[in-house]
């Protein structure tokens, strides 16, 4: 149900983070907000509260600004939105941008059962273990799949992959999370190799040149099937 009286607003801006929405504790991150050419002011909000203000530089592109977070910590991890003003009007909110801080406290162990090299169609399960008690575990595949899976668990979580296809091959890491925005150090990478069967070019392997410190993903959960939530994790890669 929508309320009858609606405020007149401008179209929503686009928000994204560079180099990534996952930032190692202590590292810097840029949050970009792109609105209209006529925008006179941009405001960044963190978890519903005003966080920072930027005015576009006349010498540069007028329709976007950069907000700089010099040191990412658990206190700056969370959801950011931005707004812009043009004349007397304010824009609608951007989509939420979730910034996660990694590199906290401990490093989990990741292993794969029955082994890292399996035949096509074999059942595979990843296990992630963290000695520090945590609430949730995340399994990420570098590049390629654009999926995160999460599982609740205290010290260990298992991620059943089912009968594997060539799409499953690639390099995986896991994290333990202390809350949705504060994650552990990443585990050592585990590369899953699939042998046998007929090569299918539509299921391309993971890009071997992918950078290990840059993650590109959508949020997925495998508690009741895989449900993509791409809008929430969209960090619109633009220059």
């Amino acid at each position: 149900q929508r309320i009858n009286t609606e405020k007149e607003t401008l179209p929503k801006p686009i928000i994204w983070a560079k180099p990534s929405i996952m930032v190692t504790n202590g590292n810097s991150v840029n949050i970009w907000c792109q609105g209209a050419q006529s925008a006179s002011e941009y405001q960044l909000y963190f978890e519903g509260s005003f966080f920072a203000l930027e005015r576009p530089k006349p010498s540069r592109s007028m329709n976007k600004v950069r907000f700089f977070i010099s040191q990412m910590t658990s206190h700056t991890a969370g959801i950011y939105t931005c707004f812009y003003q043009s004349g007397e009007l304010w824009s609608k909110s951007s989509n939420p941008l979730k910034l996660v801080v990694t590199g906290l406290y401990d490093t989990p162990n990741l292993w794969v059962y029955p082994r890292p090299e399996v035949t096509l169609g074999e059942n595979v399960t990843f296990f992630c273990q963290l000695k520090t008690a945590t609430s949730k575990f995340f399994l990420l595949k570098e590049r390629g799949s654009n999926h995160i899976q999460n599982k609740y668990g205290n010290i260990q979580a298992e991620f059943p992959m089912g009968p594997v296809t060539r799409a499953h091959r690639g390099t995986y890491r896991c994290f333990g999370s202390y809350n949705d925005y504060a994650w552990s150090f990443p585990s050592e990478p585990v590369t899953l190799l699939i042998t046998g069967g007929v090569e299918n070019s539509s299921l391309a392997p993971t890009d071997p040149t992918s950078s290990l410190d840059y993650w590109e993903f959508d949020l997925s959960t495998n508690e009741s099937g895989l449900q993509k939530d791409s809008a929430f994790w969209d960090h619109t890669t633009q220059n």
């Epitope: 149900q1 929508r2 309320i3 009286t5 609606e6 405020k7 405001q43 909000y45 963190f46 978890e47 519903g48 509260s49 969370g78 959801i79 939105t81 707004f83 304010w90 609608k92 909110s93 989509n95 939420p96 809350n179 949705d180 925005y181 939530d229 809008a231 929430f232």
Partner: nanobody, 123 residues
Framework: DVQLQESGGGLVQAGGSLRLSCAAS????????MGWFRQAPGKEREFVAA????????FYTDSVKGRFTISRDNAKNLVYLRMNSLTVEDTALYYC????????????????WGQGTQVTVSS
């Protein structure tokens, strides 16, 4: 279709407590700030409390600070309003709202609204 359904209202004596719940469906719950508003007969709908996406920040109108507590469970798509030390002035229809407001207290900046649950405080 987005639906917000409030529950937990009722008749309570002054000084008593209630807990309101709001269940959201058809929306990615964690992508929205959730708010509670209220409307007494013959009065404007007014802001009561709001909670940020990840429950990092909470916001209250002055008259309920220290008495009301807003919380949310993103895993269950629920938002709650715990109301203690209720007074006759708290009698109203309580609405749950979802949005991405710049000013959390502005009812015009919330996109979705429930039908409301009645809270009546007797002296």
């Amino acid at each position: 279709d987005v639906q917000l359904q409030e529950s937990g209202g009722g008749l309570v004596q002054a000084g008593g407590s209630l807990r309101l719940s709001c269940a959201a469906s058809g929306v990615t719950f964690s992508q929205y700030i959730m708010g509670w508003f209220r409307q007494a007969p013959g009065k404007e709908r007014e802001f009561v409390a709001a909670i940020s996406y990840g429950a990092v920040n909470t916001f209250y109108t002055d008259s309920v600070k220290g008495r009301f507590t807003i919380s949310r469970d993103n895993a269950k798509n629920l938002v709650y309003l715990r109301m203690n030390s209720l007074t006759v002035e708290d009698t109203a229809l309580y609405y749950c709202a979802a949005g991405r407001p710049r000013q959390v207290s502005s009812k015009l900046e919330y996109d979705y609204w429930g039908q409301g649950t009645q809270v009546t405080v007797s002296s």
